[in-house]
């Protein structure tokens, strides 16, 4: 001899966000007479999901025709599942009365919602850093469920190992977030480099999501300077060049000084790009040596990307050159003062 049993055959059901969840429930008898109700959670704070007898539940439909006299299937379908719907659902048989009283509950079905992580967002340091320095990159992704997730860091395809990752919250939640910080040592060749954060999750079916950061936005490669004296172009004129090599980014201002006095200031414009993404630039200065009685100290001073200026000097010997009478001009700058080198 038996009494009615409420059977929820599925201990757990996993559904992708946006899909419908079918929660199965059958009873073994038509008696006692009374409605079926579905709840999420147990105890006094449980949430009513569906009441066979009354109420409006727009997202819930019954799987079978519950108006049929012999119906004992009270399975329901919940549409447009979101992570907030996760929880344990109980099919509860009520006994007809005033009011109806709870007669028996099913064992419950745990609904887990598979929600895709958001596209990883990678952010680097606020200020640029120079080669040999270690910089930190962060990667964040949100809204995923279940909690299990894998995050990897790469630099130009090579997996990085120096990183720390946290998944929050630690306890049960409808959805989770991941936050990871990776340390990257910069090299002079990193202008074209990329740092990639790769997130793998069960919802992505083996096709991980990636977020990238270009090291070109992080790195500053300071220039190297070389000042050279070219053969005499014409009598009493000396061509001095300042070669600015391997710098990044392009923002650069060059000042020529003659014996400490500003002769000319210019901004790098027509630069050449190296294979590694850095730039080269050359500036030249025509010096009228006949205007000088003594040797001239020429200085090429470069201010790169707002950093303190670096300089390189060159001593120009003038004693061997005949002096023009009556000339007080310190220097003559004629013609083009920029030249591309390849």
């Amino acid at each position: 001899e038996e009494e009615l049993q409420v059977i929820q055959p599925d201990k757990s059901v996993s559904v992708a966000a946006g899909e419908s969840a079918i929660l199965h429930c059958t009873v073994t008898s038509l008696i006692p007479v009374g409605p079926i109700q579905w709840f999420r959670g147990a105890g006094p704070a449980r949430e009513l999901i569906y009441n066979q007898k009354e109420g409006h539940f727009p997202r819930v439909t019954t799987v079978s025709e519950s108006t049929k006299r012999e119906n004992m299937d009270f399975s329901i379908s919940i549409s447009n599942i979101t992570p907030a719907d996760a929880g344990t659902y109980y099919c509860v048989k009520f006994r007809k009365g005033s009011p109806d009283t709870e007669f028996k509950s099913g064992a419950g079905t745990e609904l887990s919602v598979r929600a895709k992580p958001s596209a990883p967002v990678v952010s680097g340091p606020a200020a640029r850093a120079t080669p040999q320095h270690t910089v930190s990159f962060t990667c964040e992704s949100h809204g995923f469920s279940p909690r299990d997730i894998t995050l990897k860091w790469f630099k130009n395809g090579n997996e990085l190992s120096d990183f720390q990752t946290n998944v929050d919250p630690v306890g049960e939640s409808v959805s989770y977030s991941i936050h990871s910080t990776a340390k990257v040592v910069l090299t002079r060749e990193d202008v074209h480099s990329q740092v990639i954060c790769e997130v793998a999750h069960v919802t992505l079916q083996g096709d991980p999501l990636r977020g990238t950061a270009n090291l070109s936005e992080t790195i500053r490669v300071p220039p190297t300077l070389e000042v050279t004296q070219q053969p005499v172009r014409a009598e009493n004129q000396v061509n001095v060049t300042c070669q600015v090599r391997k710098f990044y980014p392009q923002r650069l201002q060059l000042t020529w000084l003659e014996n400490g006095n500003v002769s000319r200031t210019e901004t790098a414009s027509t630069v050449t790009e190296n294979k590694d993404g850095t730039y080269n630039w050359m500036s030249w200065l025509l010096v009228n040596v006949s205007a000088h009685r003594d040797d001239v100290k020429l200085t090429c001073q470069v201010e790169h990307d707002g950093q303190p200026a670096v300089s390189k000097s060159h001593d120009l010997k003038v004693s061997a050159h005949p002096k023009e009478q009556g000339s007080n001009t310190a220097a003559e700058n004629t013609g083009s003062n920029e030249r591309n080198i390849y």
Partner: antibody, heavy 120, light 108 residues
Framework: QVQLQQSGPELVKPGASVKMSCKAS????????LSWVKQRTGQGLEWIGE????????YYNEKFKGKATLTADKSSNTAYIQLTSLTSEDSAVYFC?????????????WGQGTLLTVSA | ENVLTQSPEKMAVSLGQKVTMTCSAS???????LHWYQQKSGASPKPLIH???NLASGVPARFSGSGSGTSYSLTISSVEAEDAATYYC?????????FGGGTNLEIK
Amino acid sequence: QVQLQQSGPELVKPGASVKMSCKASGYTFSEYVLSWVKQRTGQGLEWIGEIYPGTITTYYNEKFKGKATLTADKSSNTAYIQLTSLTSEDSAVYFCGRFYDYDGGWFAYWGQGTLLTVSA
Amino acid sequence: ENVLTQSPEKMAVSLGQKVTMTCSASSSVSSSDLHWYQQKSGASPKPLIHGTSNLASGVPARFSGSGSGTSYSLTISSVEAEDAATYYCQQWSGYPWTFGGGTNLEIK
């Protein structure tokens, strides 16, 4: 048409047990709930309990738990009520009845009743 | 349980007379869940009215029912000899299903 045919009268001694039957015809026996109702001489009607033959599940009036046991045999379309530890209080006419429908709640069909007399 | 009290317990009326009997519930009953039966001596109960006011198959139109909440009534507009019987109300609002104690109608 729906018919409920009950077994004949019973005369039993106090302390004994009795099993009475109700044979259904004219409908699909396993699909409808059958109830049992007690009526003592010159008294009102008391609902004892009900059985769903489809899965042989029962539900009882608390007052009759331990006294009555409801069973059914789907192969013979027959429902049974067994009463144990009989006393004179159990002397009554016992009816089987079927609701009009699952959600009708009114007894549209009744058996003719079985008279149980408990006497030494 | 929901106790149904019928009154009067007995009544004797003349043919053609109008008769009203009541059924009072100890707790509210949905109108769709209140039913009436007629039982003649030595016979099983016969359905008379279901859901407060709906006549069962074959029941004459002189029978009618009304009521709501805890108060219900059965009326016979013009009593005939064959109406001599005991009348029972029954509720299906909650377990256990209960019947009233009956009203015995006698024809003078």
